[in-house]
Interface confidence: low
């Protein structure tokens, strides 16, 4: 998870049982009970946009304490503000709370740029719009911070929702997930529904406009077209997963797969913008450069750094290609692509002196430690992260904002031979994720 | 808020015309769509045509292309549908609708994509 290029969650419904189920369809699989139909109480159950992430509303505590907690798959630590901070509107009063067991233990966790730290206790968490249980989960409260929480953001707390493998301080302290499967009956799976708006939203603006969904236990037709097509999780930590070609507008990046997955590839709805390798993202941006070359634009705006505005309503999306990720498929030698649209990759921004225009900024940038499927990447699909199967599923969002000419898609099967090893084998140090 | 009233409904002959009318009050953002749908008995609404606020933009369902043609009059905050060349299948109840919104990639022909709904206008062609 890359702190500030990652996204949050919110929800702002009211708590219902898991509630109904639709009859499988006939071709699908034979699946547990209950893992796929209508979870009408969960749909809608986020806020929030890409720059800042994406929330979802959780109480913690006796009596209950509402607080709006982001949705992170890049990491895995429940942690949320426990002192006052500028930036908060609210934080978690463990002396206020029955329940609050203290672990007596501290946490530490270092970004690249800044930091939180707290102290590690447990208490009774639920999800007012998510299942009608209630779990003793381990919460860090974050007694200090520094670049960490966003400054109207609206969020007061993240939720890590990938592998103890990745916990802090080690992966003896169980993540949320994992104690709501232990403790409960839903079962081990959640999808996301993320929803960029394609415009710039203000804080009202993201107050009043749903921002997606988060269904836990399961999977909701009425959020996706078309099928879901799985990949392996490849290594239960980050929700690893393996590319094994890159096209633009169609044209094979033509690089050794091994370089889209170096060292990592994960999927990670914390993170803001798709991130590529050195490597990768520099034959990209020259590619979708030759691309889009009817029009000239700054070095500044292909680094992320600089805003490019149109007057209003004429952005020239058909100027820029499609891009298409391949992903290793559950059969042997299949694979499928995922496909996004500019209106994915070039983020909507609010540009105070050209209000009157529509401004983007580019978000694809270079990574150091792999590729992240962040947002950018998230907003075109529904991603089911079904973690009892070890795989994770995409399918064409119902909400992903596209034109009358290009749809996101997922399309497959491509016959695709020895793709393991695409995978890098990441030599054994005590990589942290949160260094990114 | 923001008030759709949709006018010029009626009945006419195959290979006749008509020109309905939306009429839209209240309050109104500066970019916005305005669309035409129509729902014929036991079918599901579908849109007809759009048009973006300026003008610039406009999108039509293959089976109206050539027949229709949408338009505008900012200054009377009003859209029109000219509809030439009418079929028995054009048969259907027309809604005016509004999108008050600033999405880039709007789609313009899904209903589910309009904030604002008229109250309809019934079109029949019946010989």
């Known amino acids: 998870t890359q702190h500030g290029i990652r996204l949050p969650l919110r929800s702002g419904l009211g708590g219902a049982p898991l509630g109904l189920r639709l009859p499988r369809e006939t071709d699908e699989e034979p699946e547990e009970p209950g893992r796929r139909g209508s979870f009408v109480e969960m749909v809608d159950n986020l806020r929030g946009k890409s720059g800042q992430g994406y929330y979802v509303e959780m109480t913690v505590g006796s009596p209950p304490q509402t607080l709006n907690i982001l949705v992170d798959t890049g990491s895995s630590n429940f942690a949320v503000g426990a002192a006052p901070h500028p930036f908060l509107h609210r934080y978690y009063q463990r002396q206020l709370s029955s329940t609050y067991r203290d672990l007596r233990k501290g946490v530490y966790v270092p970004y690249t740029q800044g930091k939180w730290e707290g102290e590690l206790g447990t208490d009774l968490v639920s999800i007012p719009h998510g299942p009608n249980v209630t779990v003793r989960a381990n919460i860090a409260a974050i007694t200090e911070s520094d670049k960490f929480f966003i400054n109207g953001s609206n969020w007061e707390g993240i939720l890590g929702l990938a592998y103890a493998e990745i916990a802090r301080p080690d992966d003896s302290l169980e993540p949320f997930f994992d104690s709501l499967v232990k403790q409960t009956h839903v079962p081990n799976l959640f999808s996301l529904q993320l929803c960029g708006a394609g415009f710039p939203l203000n804080q009202s603006e993201v107050l009043a406009s749903v921002g997606g969904s988060m269904i836990i236990g399961g999977i909701d037709h009425s959020l996706y077209t078309g099928s879901l097509w799985y990949t392996p999780i490849r290594r239960e930590w980050y929700y690893e997963v393996i590319i094994v070609r890159v096209e633009i507008n169609g044209q094979d990046l033509k690089m050794d797969c091994k370089e889209y997955n170096y060292d990592k590839s994960i999927v990670d709805s914390g993170t803001t913008n798709l991130r590529l390798p050195k490597k990768v993202f520099e034959a990209a941006v020259k590619s979708i450069k030759a691309a889009s070359s009817t029009e000239k634009f700054p070095d500044g705006f292909w680094l992320g750094e600089q805003l490019v505005c149109w007057q209003a309503g004429t952005t020239p999306w058909n100027i820029f290609p499609v891009i298409s990720l391949y992903l290793m498929g559950e059969v042997t030698n299949q694979s499928f692509r995922i496909t996004i649209l500019p209106q994915q990759y070039l983020r909507p921004v609010e540009d105070v002196a050209t209000s009157q225009d529509d401004c983007y900024k580019f978000a694809i940038s270079q990574s150091s430690t792999g590729t992240v499927m962040g947002a950018v990447i998230m907003e075109g699909f529904y991603v089911v992260f079904d973690r009892a199967r070890k795989r994770i599923g995409f399918a064409v969002s119902a909400c992903h904002v596209h034109d009358e000419f290009r749809t996101a898609a997922v399309e497959g099967p491509f016959v695709t031979l020895d793709m393991e090893d695409c995978g890098y084998n990441i030599p054994q140090t005590d990589e942290s994720t949160l260094m990114t | 808020d923001v008030q759709l009233q949709e006018s010029g409904g009626g009945s006419v002959q195959p290979g006749g015309s008509l020109r309905l009318s939306c009429a839209a009050s209240?309050?109104?953002?500066?970019?916005?769509?305005m669309g035409w749908f129509r729902q014929a008995p036991g079918k599901e609404r579908e849109g007809v045509a759009a048009?973006?606020?300026?003008?610039?933009?406009?999108s039509y369902a293959d089976s109206v292309k050539g027949r229709f043609t949408i338009s505008q009059d900012n200054a009377k905050n009003t859209v029109y549908l000219q509809m030439n060349s009418l079929k028995p299948e054009d048969t259907a109840i027309y809604y005016c609708?509004?999108?008050?919104?600033?999405?880039?990639?709007?789609?313009?022909?899904?209903?589910?994509?309009?904030?604002?709904w008229g109250q309809g206008t019934q079109v029949t062609v019946s010989s």
């Open positions: 609708a509004a999108a008050l919104s600033r999405v880039p990639g709007f789609f313009p022909l899904f209903p589910s994509q309009y904030n604002y």
């Open positions: 209240g309050y109104f953002y500066s970019r916005w769509y």
């Open positions: 048009i973006n606020s300026g003008g610039s933009i406009t």
